[in-house]
């Protein structure tokens, strides 16, 4: 039997503090060869699975969980885990998603990252794609 699977990591784009109505993408990362990622809420009672895995680097794969329009109900603690070769990994650390109005110039909306490229372009998505619709991600009510 192989050794323990590497622990996944979790992050959020554009950040963990999101104004109501704005989008957020939670990103889970693990090793190459992950078959499925799972994003869980704190109590494990609600989760979302995906097999839409892409490469984050030569040694990492990732999955992205998008919420188009966050509400107070989306606030809370999230963590990731994954399946590789029929084995489940450990959980990632918790990510605390905060939904609140941010201070500052209200005429400057939070910038929305490209959900397939993120803040830095990843080679798996380097096909100069112009065909991705602007905002058809998973809505909050479908996610949880």
């Amino acid at each position: 039997q192989e050794g323990p699977l590497p622990r996944p990591s979790i992050s959020a784009e554009p950040g963990t503090v999101i104004p109501p109505g704005r989008p957020v993408t939670i990103v889970c990362r693990g090793p190459v060869g992950v078959d499925q990622f799972r994003l869980e809420r704190e109590d494990r009672s609600k989760f979302n699975d995906t097999k839409d895995v892409s490469q984050a680097s030569p040694s990492e794969s990732e999955a992205r969980f998008r919420i188009d329009s966050v509400s107070e109900g989306n606030a809370g603690h999230y963590r990731c885990l994954y399946v590789k070769s029929t084995r489940w990994s450990e959980h990632s650390d918790y990510l605390d998603l905060v939904v609140k109005e941010t201070s500052g110039d209200t005429d400057s909306p939070v910038t929305e990252p490209d959900s397939s490229a993120g803040p830095t372009q990843r080679p798996s998505d380097n096909s100069h794609n112009e065909h991705a619709p602007a905002s058809q991600g998973l809505s909050a009510e479908h996610l949880y």
Epitope: D52, P58, S116
Partner: antibody
Framework: EVQLVESGGGLVKPGGSLRLSCAAS????????MNWVRQAPGKGLEWVAR??????????YYADSVKDRFTISRDDSKNTLYLQMNSLKTEDTAVYYC????????WGQGTLVTVSS | DIQMTQSPSSLSASVGDRVTITCLAS??????LAWYQQKPGKAPKLLIY???SLADGVPSRFSGSGSGTDFTLTISSLQPEDFATYYC?????????FGGGTKVEIK
């Protein structure tokens, strides 16, 4: 049992159009990225297009050889993948396979597209 | 685009032989590599993904190794049903390019 069944192939003249369909069953279609791969007679494999899931804005990617002529799409409510092929050329003649991503682990049986005058 | 160079393009071997096929990527792809087997008139079948992981239902005589730019598919003891064409494919970046194929024939 995972099944991918392609349809819509046939004989078409250069410049014509065809729409391929792939009916998926036996797995949760809407959480999987999907691909089209083709194989010209007696030749090797060529990746054609990829479509991601709703979580990824249904982002699409194409081989340069088909960009601006082919469009990949999906209908998750029908568990169906599509490939709309316009401005077809003789070099598009091939067997077209529907393939589950990201590791190309399940393939359909293929549908033959022949472009000839 | 990443080019995948597969060698040899064909080989003749006997049942029981150890067979090695190599694939060279034009730039580093980590372990984002898959190997497929295709028999005439049939769809390809996934053998190896993530360079070294055996796909479901694939016999253990098949193994994959390598990372970065150099990869190998090994069949430890060739069986009659293994005579086929084998392809590598990089899954690191689109377009997801395939190698040219290796036809394994009966000696």
């Amino acid at each position: 049992e995972v099944q991918l069944v392609e349809s819509g192939g046939g004989l078409v003249k250069p410049g014509g159009s065809l729409r391929l369909s792939c009916a998926a069953s036996g797995f949760t279609f809407n959480i999987n990225a999907m691909n089209w791969v083709r194989q010209a007679p007696g030749k090797g494999l060529e990746w054609v297009a990829r479509i991601r899931t709703k979580n990824n804005n249904f982002a699409t990617y194409y081989a340069d050889s088909v960009k601006d002529r082919f469009t990949i799409s999906r209908d998750d409510s029908k568990n169906t993948l599509y490939l709309q092929m316009n401005s077809l050329k003789t070099e598009d003649t091939a067997v077209y396979y529907c393939v589950r991503g990201p590791y190309f682990d399940y393939w359909g049986q293929g549908t033959l597209v022949t472009v000839s005058s | 685009d990443i080019q995948m160079t597969q060698s040899p393009s064909s080989l003749s071997a006997s049942v029981g032989d150890r067979v090695t096929i190599t694939c060279l990527a034009s730039q580093t792809i980590g372990t984002w590599l898959a190997w497929y087997q295709q028999k005439p008139g049939k769809a390809p079948k996934l053998l190896i993904y993530a360079a070294t992981s055996l796909a479901d239902g694939v016999p253990s005589r098949f193994s994959g190794s390598g990372s970065g730019t150099d990869f190998t598919l090994t069949i430890s003891s060739l069986q009659p049903e293994d005579f086929a064409t084998y392809y590598c494919q990089q899954l690191y970046s689109t377009p997801y390019t395939f190698g040219g194929g290796t036809k394994v024939e009966i000696k």
